[in-house]
């Protein structure tokens, strides 16, 4: 397993909708053909695995139909979109690449994109 | 190298409590998590739960219903995993582990194991 | 809590001969991970993150799967590979394993 750089931003503020988008860049030693991306949640002592998608460099990333996440690549950039957050989602959301082929196999992981989701205030009942 | 290394064979009253220690060595131990997992005879391996070192903070299966507590003594590297009002279906192996690297391959160092026996 | 389902519950194969494991989950995960435990002993990690063969294991295991149904599979059984093969989950807390697949050698 060989080591590989891999940048994301440091704090991200999701919409009142509850997305967050954020950009996964790595850098590529080689001319990987399969890649695959993770997205892992750490709060607290807990690290859960959000999502994950494998795809051949050109084409777009596949996530499984009931995952939260969504993303589309562009070279060594991965652009990956979270949706369906709520407050208690609020976490470090850890970008993890694989370069799956050809060998050799490189891991890279991200120091972690800080995600802030604020639950929007219920809109007051109006009376006309 | 990383080593995980458990206390010895308990055995215990029903109603008491036992505190099984884990000493770390081979790497920092405030990087890591540890879990705890155990096997009972004839059973499969169960996730207690676990504490991050560093922060101190804990995360329990609710299946053992508040019974179980984490703790951690950085000065020492050393873990160790409390369970309380033991009943006979408490005897178990019960084991300490951790991640292979940040964040992937998990649960790639194991402790020997503990052997826990519940009996009046 | 996500529930895993092993199948078959032990087999019993040759040495030489393939052997397959498969584990369900009761919703969908992004990884499954794989440990062998033989008695006496503590648990082996085998296969994490689906495929990914942990270090030291031989190329002979190989894991594979998405969603909730997954697959270890051994190219080619050995003496050695006798033991309860585990899978486990950690997409949500708490974490669960699998009800464990004997593997027995004829």
């Known amino acids: 397993c060989k080591a590989m750089h891999v940048a994301q931003p440091a704090v991200v503020l999701a919409s009142s909708r509850g997305i967050a988008s954020f950009v996964c860049e790595y850098a590529s030693p080689g001319k990987a053909t399969e890649v695959r991306v993770t997205v892992l949640r750490q709060a607290d002592s807990q690290v859960t695995e959000v999502c994950a998608a494998t795809y051949m460099m050109g084409n777009e990333l596949t996530f499984l139909d009931d995952s939260i996440c969504t993303g589309t690549s562009s070279g060594n950039q991965v652009n990956l979109t979270i949706q369906g957050l709520r407050a208690m989602d609020t976490g470090l959301y850890i970008c993890k690449v694989e370069l799956m082929y050809p060998p050799p196999y490189y891991l890279g992981i991200g120091n972690g994109t800080q995600i802030y989701v604020i639950d929007p205030e219920p809109c007051p009942d109006s009376d006309f | 190298e990383v080593q995980l290394v458990q206390s010895g064979a308990e055995v215990k009253k029903p109603g008491a409590s036992v505190k099984v220690s884990c000493k770390a060595s081979?790497?920092?131990?405030?990087?890591?998590?540890m879990d705890w997992v155990r096997q009972a005879p004839g059973a499969g391996l169960d996730w207690m739960g676990n504490?991050?070192?560093?922060?101190?903070?804990?995360s329990y299966n609710q299946k053992f219903k508040g019974r179980v507590t984490l703790t951690a003594d950085t000065s020492t590297s050393t873990a160790y995993m409390e369970l309380s009002s033991l009943r006979a279906g408490d005897i178990a192996v019960y084991y300490c582990?951790?991640?292979?690297?940040?964040?992937?391959?998990?649960?790639?160092?194991w402790g020997q194991g503990t052997l826990v026996t519940v009996s009046s | 809590d996500i529930v895993m389902t092993q199948t078959p519950l032990s087999l019993s194969v040759s040495p030489g001969e393939p052997a397959s494991i498969s584990c369900s989950a009761s919703?969908?995960?992004?990884?499954m991970h794989w440990f062998r435990h033989k008695p006496g002993q503590s648990p082996q990690s085998l296969i994490y993150?689906?495929?990914i063969l942990a270090s030291g294991v031989p190329d002979r295991f190989s894991g594979s799967g998405s969603g909730t149904d997954f697959t270890l599979k051994i190219s080619r059984v050995e003496a050695d590979d006798a033991g309860v093969y585990y899978c486990q989950q950690r997409t949500s807390y708490p974490l669960t394993f699998g009800t464990g697949t004997k593997l027995e050698l004829k």
């Open positions: 919703s969908s995960v992004t990884y």
């Open positions: 081979g790497y920092t131990f405030t990087d890591y998590n």
């Open positions: 582990t951790r991640d292979g690297n940040r964040y992937d391959a998990w649960f790639a160092y």
């Open positions: 993150s689906t495929s």
């Open positions: 504490i991050n070192p560093n922060s101190e903070s804990t």
